[in-house]
């Protein structure tokens, strides 16, 4: 018996088609993805093949103005339209708190939303009961398939799930649910979840009875053969893991941003064992037409976005200096504003010993593309911010050793004076450079804001200590020559859309007046 699994993950509000790098579509003839194009391909496969499941492995939320404006209603609406069969909760589904998950998505979705390792307690338990499930048994043709969900247990550090949701260890939580499915005579079981490729592989290895793992969170691209676009495969598709009980378990992920549709064909025997598995992600490029009815619906929903872009978010009473003449040479107040917003967006009081889990921000000056003039009645709009941060990136959480940070700051000024983009703007960091010294030895003082303290203060950076840092995904991926960050990072979790982080902060503060205050000397 053959099952076709179609899967997406980490779509991050890319409802409209995008350019090849998943930013805003400029030249439509070269654009990719989007729900209208996805629907065309899904329908084509549904018509051609008998047993098809369409699954999403989480993080539909967060990433473009679509989420900022519609707050998840767009996810429910278009996933319903595409007739998804199931979705796992990702960490970003909690970005607007539990209410921001329950009302727009959980209550509106016509498909099961799953996570076995999230347990509700207190008053939330009855409120959320039945709105998400640990597993769901789906009829497919004359067979049944069990789908069991999981979510990164790091979610409390990455999003805003509140205090009434407990995130358990994935493997510990999944095993009893899989065992329950087995007692219900469900012998074909897919683990669908959002904890990253390493955890996906562990689940395949450790959870007895899981036949296939469909994952997300790490934006992993797998491919067998010659890849069709710019993404470099992390392994073959599917990636085969030998389980502790001697089975070959296929593990898949489909990159991110709706650029690909994962396509996996699984052959099961009478006992539910995987006899064979093969497939590849399908690149959703312009050779696949956008479905006209979904496209018309997108255009209808788009109107509200255009109106939103020109509305006032808040005011500035100072000039926000985002000029390259400032931000690529010295501390600039636009850099300070953005870094302050980045830290503010990551306030998570999860431990009494820590005032916050992260205190540091770095930001490449070259990523700041425009100033904002205060002489327009001080008004700041989304449109203004889109000029400052036009690349549609995210502000991510990484863990780095002190020694890596030191290398990063040396790189920041290794060719100082040439107006290059790698000059770092900071938050929660005091750095002193001596530019008379030779490149690679110019950082003379590097103090960082403590986290394990009740009164934050600056202490010297320790080379062997592990620090959490918020930075643009561009830097986490080694951009602007920061290869040491990419090569040496110990953990990387993708964060919220850059413009959204700054706009939320400005809306919260109402009036802003960032200063140049001696963070960089």
């Amino acid at each position: 018996w053959e099952l076709t699994i179609l899967h997406t993950n980490d779509v991050h509000s890319r409802l409209e088609q995008t350019s090849e790098d998943s930013s805003k579509c400029v030249n439509a003839s070269r654009c990719m993805g989007g729900v209208a194009r996805l629907f065309t391909k899904v329908q084509q496969i549904r018509r051609a093949e008998p047993n098809v499941l369409l699954l999403d492995a989480g993080d539909q939320y967060q990433g473009t103005i679509w989420f900022t404006v519609y707050k998840g209603a767009e996810v429910a609406h278009f996933m319903n339209a595409l007739r998804y069969d199931a979705m796992a909760l990702g960490n970003h589904e909690f970005d607007n708190g539990v209410e921001g998950l329950i009302e727009p998505l959980l209550k509106e979705a016509k498909f099961p939303i799953l996570s076995a390792n999230i347990k509700a307690k207190g008053p939330l338990a009855s409120q959320i009961s039945g709105l998400y499930l640990p597993y769901k048994v789906l009829p497919v043709g004359d067979e049944v398939v069990g789908i069991v969900g999981y979510t990164s247990k790091e979610t409390p550090f990455l999003s805003n799930p509140g205090t009434n949701l407990v995130f358990e260890d994935e493997i510990t939580a999944l095993q009893p649910e899989v065992d329950k499915l087995k007692t219900l005579n469900v012998n074909k079981i897919i683990a669908l979840g959002h904890s990253g490729f390493e955890m996906d592989k562990l689940i395949a290895q450790k959870v007895r009875g899981v036949d296939v793992v469909v994952g997300g969170h790490s934006n992993t691209f797998l491919y067998t053969g010659n890849p069709p676009s710019k993404e470099v495969p992390a392994g073959k598709y599917p990636f085969i893991v030998t389980s502790d009980d001697g089975r070959k378990v296929p593990v898949v992920q489909a990159y991110a941003f709706g650029k690909y549709l994962g396509y996996l064909k699984i052959e099961f025997d009478e006992r539910g064992n995987v006899i064979s598995s093969h497939g590849n992600p399908i690149l959703l490029n312009s050779s696949i037409p956008e479905d006209p009815s979904i496209k018309a619906d997108i255009n209808k929903w788009r109107i509200k976005l255009d109106n939103y872009s020109t509305q006032e978010l808040g005011k500035t009473i100072v000039y926000l200096d985002g000029s390259s003449q400032s931000c690529r040479f010295r501390e600039c107040n636009m850099g300070n504003l953005i870094c302050d917003a980045m830290i503010n967006n990551n306030l998570r009081h999860t431990d009494e010993m820590f005032w916050n889990h992260v205190s540091m921000c770095i930001l490449n000056g070259g990523g700041i593309r425009s100033p904002i003039d205060e002489r327009n009645n001080g008004t700041i709009t989304w449109e203004n911010l889109a000029a400052v941060l036009p690349f549609g990136g995210t502000f991510d959480l990484v863990q780095l050793k002190g020694s890596t940070l030191k290398k990063a700051f040396e790189h920041s000024v290794h060719r100082y004076g040439q107006s290059t983009g790698e000059f770092l703007q900071v938050g929660g960091i005091h750095v002193v450079y001596d530019l008379s010294r030779k490149p690679g030895d110019r950082v003379v003082k590097l103090d960082v804001l403590c986290t394990k303290c009740r009164v934050p203060s600056y202490d010297p950076l320790k080379m062997d200590e592990v620090y959490k840092v918020i930075l643009p995904n561009f830097l986490a991926n080694g951009g602007d020559g920061f290869q040491m960050i990419k090569d040496e990072l110990l953990r990387h979790d993708s964060g919220d859309q850059d413009i959204n982080v700054v706009s939320t902060y400005i809306s919260k503060m109402k009036v802003i007046y960032p200063a140049v205050e001696g963070r960089i000397k």
Epitope: W1, E143, E270, R271, V274, I275, S276
Partner: antibody
């Protein structure tokens, strides 16, 4: 639990027709095929034929003229019919799942006058 | 038709021995190979499917490997209950079996 059970006569006269039934539980014949295999005493396993989930059948070329496999999906039963039986057809007859994950106990059929 | 050549046809071994049985296909069967165990008076039991995956409840001393046309069943440490006849079965085309290997007590 996934099980298969063969049933039918233990003794068949030469030139007669053998009819064996394989009763399936734990899975659906609309999703999986059933294979038939035999093993003469002290000899090797020999594939006879298969009926697929869609209802079509394939046969070992050596038996194509006298073998028919059919099924009744609603009853979860597959029937093997072999005409013109000969003493050399004396064997244990097995039905098995399409992928060989499950086998019946086998039924010994003796062809003798 | 795909032919399967299994060797040896029989072997004598002691408890604790490592035993290896091989099957050669007349053409590439793309990992579509099972290993079966047959004991007198008992139902045939599949031990390994898709070349190397272990069936539920089968001890980990059994392992399968191979690709293309060459396949191997290994019993890492023979136990008293392992004395039986073993068959390879290809299902890339119409089923064909190897000639069997009878594992006897030395």
């Amino acid at each position: 639990e996934v099980t298969l059970k063969e049933s039918g006569p233990v003794l068949v006269k030469p030139t007669e027709t053998l009819t064996l039934t394989c009763t399936v539980s734990g899975f659906s014949l609309s999703s999986y095929g059933i294979q038939w295999v035999r093993q003469p005493p002290g000899k090797l396993l020999e594939w006879l034929g298969v009926i697929w989930s869609g209802g079509s059948a394939d046969y070992n070329a050596a038996f194509i003229s006298r073998l028919t496999i059919s099924k009744d999906t609603s009853k979860s039963q597959v029937v093997l019919t072999m005409t013109n039986m000969d003493p050399v057809d004396t064997a244990t007859y097995y039905c098995a799942g399409q992928y060989g994950s499950v086998w019946g106990q086998g039924t010994l059929v003796t062809v003798s006058s | 038709d795909i032919q399967m050549t299994q060797s040896p046809s029989s072997l004598s071994a002691s408890v604790g021995d490592r035993v290896t049985i091989t099957c050669r296909a007349s053409q590439d069967i793309g990992d579509r190979l099972n290993w079966l165990q047959q004991k007198p008076g008992k139902a045939i039991k599949r031990l390994i499917y898709a070349t190397s995956s272990l069936d539920s409840g089968v001890p980990k001393r059994f392992s399968g490997s191979g690709s293309g046309t060459e396949y191997t069943l290994t019993i890492s440490s023979l136990q008293p209950e392992d004395f039986a006849t073993y068959y390879c079965l290809q299902y890339a085309g119409s089923w064909t079996f190897g000639g069997g290997t009878k594992v006897e007590i030395k």
